[in-house]
């Protein structure tokens, strides 16, 4: 039961995380105009990964896409790439984890296959979450650098009467959504990896088992090997020792080939 709960929760948390990563990637508020120096502006600027927007006090909002690819900063391109990689990996992870869920039966899929799929999706979620966190952090770092650069520029060359107030940008809502979503995906991935351990057959815990062959020699076969070559198909192998108490989750409705060594 605990394994199913862990796996299911990991799936749900990752699903929410990936939805958040997608939302953050699509959001326009990656950076928003800093109003510290001009709180009464009638024009409010904010920018996303794909377009920049201007919202007027009148309620009118105008957005313009970044129609150039080569003219954009390399850092922005890198952030875009990280977020897209995160989404793609997350989406594949979700697809894999659906089939890996213990509560879903697909034909006669074995526990080992489900365990492998759970581990694969878990790793994908972890990498997806890391990509999102990295992407958002790179963008945040870029904002901080530009913020202090524009602050320095604001106080230079102001000896004359005319002020050129440079627009400074600060963290937008999308950054926080991205950080939280990346964290959730990461946590979900870790939970999937933990669930995988519970799903995997506990063959490695089996002690060496002695078999009485019909011949005059005694054969020893460690339980860790799945292959049963060298034995006749009709040989009945007895499980002498089960390394741990089997949880309710691990009870099979029908015997699988991993129930016996």
């Amino acid at each position: 039961m605990a394994v199913t709960a862990c796996q299911g929760l990991g799936f749900v948390v990752s699903l929410i995380g990936i939805a958040g990563i997608i939302a953050a990637t699509c959001m326009d508020q990656w950076s928003t105009q800093d109003l510290y120096n001009n709180p009464v502006t009638a024009v409010f600027n904010y920018q996303g990964l794909w377009r920049s927007c201007v919202r007027e006090s009148s309620g009118f909002t105008e957005c313009r896409g970044y129609f150039t690819l080569l003219g954009l900063p390399a850092m922005l391109q890198a952030v875009r790439a990280l977020m897209i990689v995160g989404i793609v990996l997350g989406a594949i992870g979700l697809l894999v984890s659906i089939f890996a869920l213990k509560c879903i039966r697909i034909g006669s899929m074995e526990d080992s296959a489900k365990a492998n799929m759970t581990l694969t999706s878990g790793i994908m979620f972890i990498v997806s979450g890391l990509c999102a966190i990295a992407g958002v952090s790179v963008f945040a770092n870029m904002l901080v650098t530009n913020f202090w650069m524009s602050t320095a520029n604001m106080y230079t060359g102001m000896g004359g009467m005319v002020q050129t107030v440079q627009t400074r940008y600060t963290f937008g809502a999308a950054l926080f959504v991205g950080w939280v979503a990346g964290g959730l995906t990461l946590i979900g991935g870790v939970m999937m990896c933990i669930a995988c351990r519970g799903l995997a057959p506990e063959e490695t815990n089996y002690k060496a088992v002695s078999y009485h062959a019909s011949g005059h020699s005694v054969a020893y076969k460690p339980g860790g090997f799945k292959a049963s070559t060298g034995f006749g198909s009709n040989t009945k192998n007895k499980k002498i020792y089960d390394g741990g108490a089997r949880t309710e989750d691990e009870v099979q409705s029908y015997p699988s080939k991993h129930d016996y060594v």
Partner: antibody
Framework: QVQLKESGPGLVAPSQSLSITCTVS????????VSWVRQPPGKGLEWLGV???????NYHSALISRLSISKDNSKSQVFLKLNSLQTDDTATYYC??????????WGQGTLVTVSA | DIVMTQSPSSLAMSVGQKVTMSCKSS????????????LAWYQQKPGQSPKLLVY???TRESGVPDRFIGSGSGTDFTLTISSVQAEDLADYFC?????????FGSGTKLEIK
Amino acid sequence: QVQLKESGPGLVAPSQSLSITCTVSGFSLTSYGVSWVRQPPGKGLEWLGVIWGDGSTNYHSALISRLSISKDNSKSQVFLKLNSLQTDDTATYYCAGGLRLWFAYWGQGTLVTVSA
Amino acid sequence: DIVMTQSPSSLAMSVGQKVTMSCKSSQSLLNSSNQKNYLAWYQQKPGQSPKLLVYFASTRESGVPDRFIGSGSGTDFTLTISSVQAEDLADYFCQQHYSTPFTFGSGTKLEIK
């Protein structure tokens, strides 16, 4: 077509309050912003404040303590209230509206004289 | 507050002449995000309400004759009347609509000789 019409008292005694109503037609106050602008005789234009479509307001910093702008969307009316009037508040008061930040439509104005 | 300075305060021109009036702002009115200048020009004929001529520094309001041309960027702006007509006798005001309070210039009075 779009029309704005101001109605005011004409004469106000010093230290009293001024109330002017701007009645609009041809557009909805829920989507248009309405500003108040005044012009002292023979002088330039002075922006007083604005009420936006969503009901939010901005006031001129010099008048913020004694100016209030409100509206009634259902009656298509915008109200200006200016307290503690002085003689230098004598001016023609205009309401001006627009969908954006500039003033595309203007009322004909109402002359307010502050005098004892 | 952004201070708007207009010059000249008045000018007299003959019909058909080209008229140029200037407006300077104490801060840049150019929004870097959409590359638009938040400046408008108004015409006020004697005894009338002001009328919008130009917004975004160079976009003519519908119904405004094409002899009225707005130009400039940042802090320096110009309203040009390419061929002045008798009906252009009026006061012309520039106004910034970039930040509140929205401030007007003191105006330029155009007289016809």
